[in-house]
């Protein structure tokens, strides 16, 4: 059994999240994850899910009764989702910490928008680039 | 030229983001994107970047002078990043809208944590599942 299981059960008790009524009105994440099988689609969704959990854990970081559980789960997330790659985790963390109301951040974001957009399509940076661009042109030719 | 380019230039004027001083103290997104070549890694980062832009655009949705530009760019993001797939965009939107301070959301998130974690490793849901599980077990086998 993976180490996070025991610690997640501990968090369930703390948050009173073990009861069947918690599942009322559908799921938050599981139903969405079920919709996506392609690895890159899954990463788009999991990126948001992982950032949600990190934010949640941050809000409870000073609560001693669940600190060990939270630290174990965060470590396990880093091993599983970021493959223990601290640079990946650090870059992710930077992105999640940018404030959308900061004027300098806004200006920078708009300044970079054209280049960000140019890289958004899959394979925009790989050898597949020419083909994907042609496909896009094809899609737009008949609009 | 893709439609977003002209509209992004319009936003640059609005946000006063065309000056060279905007690039001082490094980039927000471009430097990070440069670090990641693997498609799945890029999706992890781009997921956060796209959600940032959607939040930013939401804050300016009532500003008539840039409404057309914002709409055009959002549409282009949907084409490029979500491959015009409305279900993908809708699922993404749901994830970005969950409030981390909502008690019911917290309980649901903790309730689903074990299953979310089980799916975090690449290929956990694909044909490679058995092999990746064996690798993880192998790593922990001597405890």
């Amino acid at each position: 059994q993976d180490p996070y299981v025991k610690e997640a059960e501990n968090l369930k008790k703390y948050f009173n999240a073990g009861h069947s009524d918690v599942a009322d009105n559908g799921t938050l994440f599981l139903g969405i994850l079920k919709n996506w099988k392609e690895e890159s689609d899954r990463k788009i969704m999991q990126s948001q899910i992982v950032s949600f959990y990190f934010k949640l854990f941050k809000n409870f970081k000073d609560d001693q009764s669940i600190q060990k559980s939270v630290e174990t789960i965060k470590e396990d997330m880093n091993v599983k989702f970021f493959n223990s790659n601290k640079k990946k985790r650090d870059d992710f963390e930077k992105l999640t910490n940018y404030s959308v109301t900061d004027l300098n951040v806004q200006r920078k974001a708009i300044h970079e928008l054209i280049q960000v957009m140019a890289e958004l399509s899959p394979a925009a940076k790989t050898g597949k680039r020419k083909r994907s661009q042609m496909l896009f042109r094809g899609r737009r030719a008949s609009q | 030229q893709d439609p977003y380019v002209k509209e992004a230039e319009n936003l640059k004027k609005y946000f006063n983001a065309g000056h060279s001083d905007v690039a001082d103290n490094g980039t927000l997104f471009l430097g990070i994107l440069k670090n990641w070549k693997e498609e799945s890694d890029r999706k992890i980062m781009q997921s956060q970047i796209v959600s940032f832009y959607f939040k930013l655009f939401k804050n300016f949705k009532d500003d008539q002078s840039i409404q057309k530009s914002v709409e055009t760019i959002k549409e282009d993001m949907n084409v490029k990043f979500f491959n015009s797939n409305k279900k993908k965009r809708d699922d993404f939107e749901k994830l970005t809208n969950y409030s981390v301070t909502d008690l019911n959301v917290q309980r649901k998130a903790i309730h689903e944590l074990i299953q979310v974690m089980a799916e975090l490793s690449p290929a956990a849901k694909t044909g490679k599942r058995k092999r990746s599980q064996m690798l993880f077990r192998g790593r922990r086998a001597s405890q």
Partner: antibody, heavy 124, light 111 residues
Framework: EVQLVESGGGLVKPGDSLTVSCVAS????????IHWVRQAPGKGLEWVAT????????FYSDSLRGRFTVSRDNANNSVYLHMSSLRGEDTALYYC?????????????????WGRGTLVTVSS | NFMLTQPHSVSESPGKTITISCTRG????????VQWYQQRPGGVPKIVVF?????PSGVPDRISGSIDTSTNSASLTISGLQTEDEADYYC??????????FGGGTKLTVL
């Protein structure tokens, strides 16, 4: 002050087994990954194995997998490297090194703190 | 393989500047942090640059690290060379399974 102290090295015969230990102090031990790195006489550094902090996941060098086993006892701030079917080429100074705290995004550098090493000599 | 290739040795006079390269054979240099270690004869390796460009406290600013994505390599630069800089220098990064990998080491001789 962060300290890592290895012990258990010595002279063993080819084919024998040996367990080297590392005791740590000066930090919250269970939060940190621990690496084993070795250095043969006059040679470069070679990574041997890593064990994660609270989750105790184990990672091994491909060339050593199957012969070496890493484990840890967080209650006693200790890490162990069990080596079996030892060969002459395993003769080296074995270092215990503190890794990242992967539960903390502001963790100190990887492989920042090293022990002084324990010498393992495999010879008939 | 994921070899990190370093020159076997470099030598230079006191006061001069040297650069030691560390070229990644497979995988992308920018996707994994690079560390540099100094090991004096009979001593324990000591980190002099971590996370590509960062210097631990106590390491002089004569020592710096950088990444060059165009050559898929990292570099360690030491300016104002001093006799105490004479040592072996190792670069270190990670493979795609995030296992630790070391370069073969570079012997720096201060003439």
């Amino acid at each position: 002050e962060v300290q890592l102290v290895e012990s258990g090295g010595g002279l063993v015969k080819p084919g024998d087994s040996l367990t080297v230990s590392c005791v740590a102090s000066g930090f919250t031990f269970s939060n940190y990954f621990i690496h084993w790195v070795r250095q043969a006489p006059g040679k470069g550094l070679e990574w041997v194995a890593t064990i994660s902090g609270r989750t105790k996941y184990m990672f091994y060098s491909d060339s050593l997998r199957g012969r070496f086993t890493v484990s840890r006892d967080n209650a006693n701030n200790s890490v162990y490297l069990h080596m079996s079917s030892l060969r002459g080429e395993d003769t080296a100074l074995y270092y215990c090194v503190r890794g990242y705290d992967h539960s903390d995004s502001n963790s100190a550098a990887d492989l920042l703190h090293w022990g002084r090493g324990t010498l393992v000599t495999v010879s008939s | 393989n994921f070899m990190l290739t370093q020159p076997h040795s470099v030598s230079e006079s006191p006061g001069k500047t040297i650069t030691i390269s560390c070229t990644r054979g497979r995988g992308y240099i920018a996707s994994y942090y690079v560390q540099w270690y100094q090991q004096r004869p009979g001593g324990v390796p000591k980190i002099v640059v971590f996370e590509d460009t960062q210097r631990p406290s106590g390491v002089p600013d004569r020592i710096s690290g950088s990444i060059d994505t165009s050559t898929n390599s990292a570099s360690l630069t030491i300016s104002g060379l001093q006799t105490e800089d004479e040592a072996d220098y190792y670069c270190q990064s990670y493979d795609d399974a995030n296992h630790v990998i070391f370069g073969g080491g570079t012997k720096l001789t201060v003439l």
